[in-house]
Interface confidence: low
């Protein structure tokens, strides 16, 4: 969470941004809020990116002004126009690219004053893992797969019964480059598993952490998975 203040004559407004992460190839949001102003025509929103000459996006007089927009962002940005008057200056970014990572500034000017705040935007790829029982193996094993990760993550296994055990010797992890030559498919196999146990496959890079759990009993297999972005907020 970053809060910035600006001064315009005697007036300043608070602008707040949140560090966030974008998933390559998907749409992302750069979050920014400010003190509301009912005079829409007096609100100017400018998004800038460090190292880029030209604007990421500009909204003023109630509409987008993309005359100074950098080519990198052409056709890929939008503000939530109907929410500007209530203080939402967040930017929607289509088709997130690896090169979108960096430091952005959300600059606001209203009839009340002006202010700005920076945010760090990380880009990468992250996806939910899925664990299945691998019946093709000579011994009972589990296969954890996640389709898209970047940068290359670490993969670790854990077990509810053998807490603190190191499974690196009885697991094998591979990374297969996807067709776009950036992201990779993660596959990890855990051997010699026992029934009536819950196993977790944890995939983590500097952007996200994902965990897949599988509970194997004589009668059923239960699965769950979760994903959280790191250093966000």
């Amino acid at each position: 969470l970053i809060i910035g203040f600006g001064i315009s004559g005697k007036h300043f407004i608070t602008v707040t941004t949140f560090t966030s992460a974008g998933n390559i190839g998907e749409d992302g949001t750069l979050s920014c809020t400010f003190e509301p102003d009912i005079k829409l025509n007096g609100i100017v929103i400018q998004w800038l990116k460090e190292g880029i000459k030209g604007l990421v996006h500009e909204f003023k007089e109630g509409k987008d002004d993309l005359s100074q927009q950098h080519e990198m962002f052409r056709g890929r940005t939008a503000v939530f126009a109907d929410q500007v008057v209530v203080g939402n200056a967040s930017l929607r970014l289509k088709n997130v690219q690896l090169t979108d990572a960096g430091t952005y500034t959300c600059y606001i000017r209203t009839s009340k004053g002006k202010g700005n705040a920076n945010l760090e935007y990380k880009t990468g790829a992250f996806s939910m893992p899925e664990i299945n029982v691998d019946y093709n193996a000579s011994s009972e094993s589990l296969r954890c797969e996640a389709p898209r990760w970047f940068p290359q993550p670490t993969v670790a296994w854990a077990s509810q019964v053998d807490q603190g055990a190191n499974f690196s010797e009885v697991s094998n992890t591979s990374f297969e480059l996807n067709s776009e030559n950036v992201t990779m498919k993660v596959v990890s196999v855990l051997y010699n598993v026992t029934i009536n146990n819950t196993y977790s496959c944890m995939i983590e890079n500097d952007i996200a952490k994902a965990t897949g759990d599988i509970k194997v009993t004589d009668s059923e297999v239960k699965r769950r998975s979760q994903l959280q972005l790191l250093n966000s907020g």
């Epitope: 190292g51 880029i52 000459k53 030209g54 005359s67 100074q68 950098h70 080519e71 990198m72 090169t99």
Partner: antibody
């Protein structure tokens, strides 16, 4: 096919103003930064500065006080002026196009103009 | 400004040999903004590699780029007669844009 063609005076006396123009044929003028680079005889490359279609300029701090880069978008041309030249400004001057965001490199260059400063 | 130091200054090799050219930055440069050029006498430079490792259009695959942070490398896997020239690295991670001093690859 994008082509950059440049012209201007090749022989100057010390204290005069160097003036070069570069015309852009093919491609969009508005999507790039248009750049001047120079290379003294037998030496390396030095970035002078750049301009985009809206007139935004960026100059090398070492030359900033003497350099003006301007553009005439209606003609797809941009120009370099370097005032108060000395023998140290003798170089081949190139115009070039700084390519888009995914590239940040000079894909297209002019043919180069040798500018000699001599009394 | 970011200073790019290229080494060696001159590389004497025979056709068919492998050439490894180095470029070191005085501070970290995002690989997005690192490029390599080839220049032959009387000609303008020609871009070979951009984004530290991506070959420009029409560049043979014997040319490859690698590196990150402050250390970047241009490799010519097997020198052809037409590859003997001067090579420059260039950054625009921060202004001003700067070039390295160049490495001359000459015939041994």
């Amino acid at each position: 096919q994008v082509q950059l063609q440049q012209w201007g005076a090749g022989l100057l006396k010390p204290s005069e103003t160097l003036s070069l123009t570069c015309a852009v044929y093919g491609g969009s003028f508005s999507d790039y930064f248009w750049t001047w680079i120079r290379q003294p005889p037998g030496k390396g490359l030095e970035w002078i500065g750049e301009i985009n279609h809206s007139g935004t300029t960026n100059y090398n701090p070492s030359l900033k006080s003497r350099v003006t880069i301007s553009a005439d978008t209606s003609k797809n041309q941009f120009s370099l002026r370097l005032s108060s030249v000395t023998a140290a400004d003798t170089a081949v001057y190139y115009c070039a196009r700084l390519s888009s965001w995914s590239n940040w490199a000079f894909e297209y260059w002019g043919q180069g103009t040798l500018v000699t400063v001599s009394s | 400004e970011i200073v790019l130091t290229q080494f060696p200054g001159t590389l004497s090799l025979s056709p068919g040999e492998r050439a490894t050219l180095s470029c070191r930055a005085s501070q970290s440069v995002s690989s997005t903004y690192l490029a390599w050029y080839q220049q032959k006498p009387g000609q303008a430079p020609r871009v070979l590699i951009y984004g530290a490792s991506r070959r420009a259009t029409g560049i043979p695959d014997r040319f490859s780029g690698s590196g990150s942070g402050t250390d970047f490398t241009l490799t010519i896997s097997r020198l052809e007669p037409e590859d003997f020239a001067v090579y420059y690295c260039q950054q625009y991670g921060s202004s001003p844009l700067t070039f390295g001093g160049g490495t001359k690859v000459e015939i041994k």
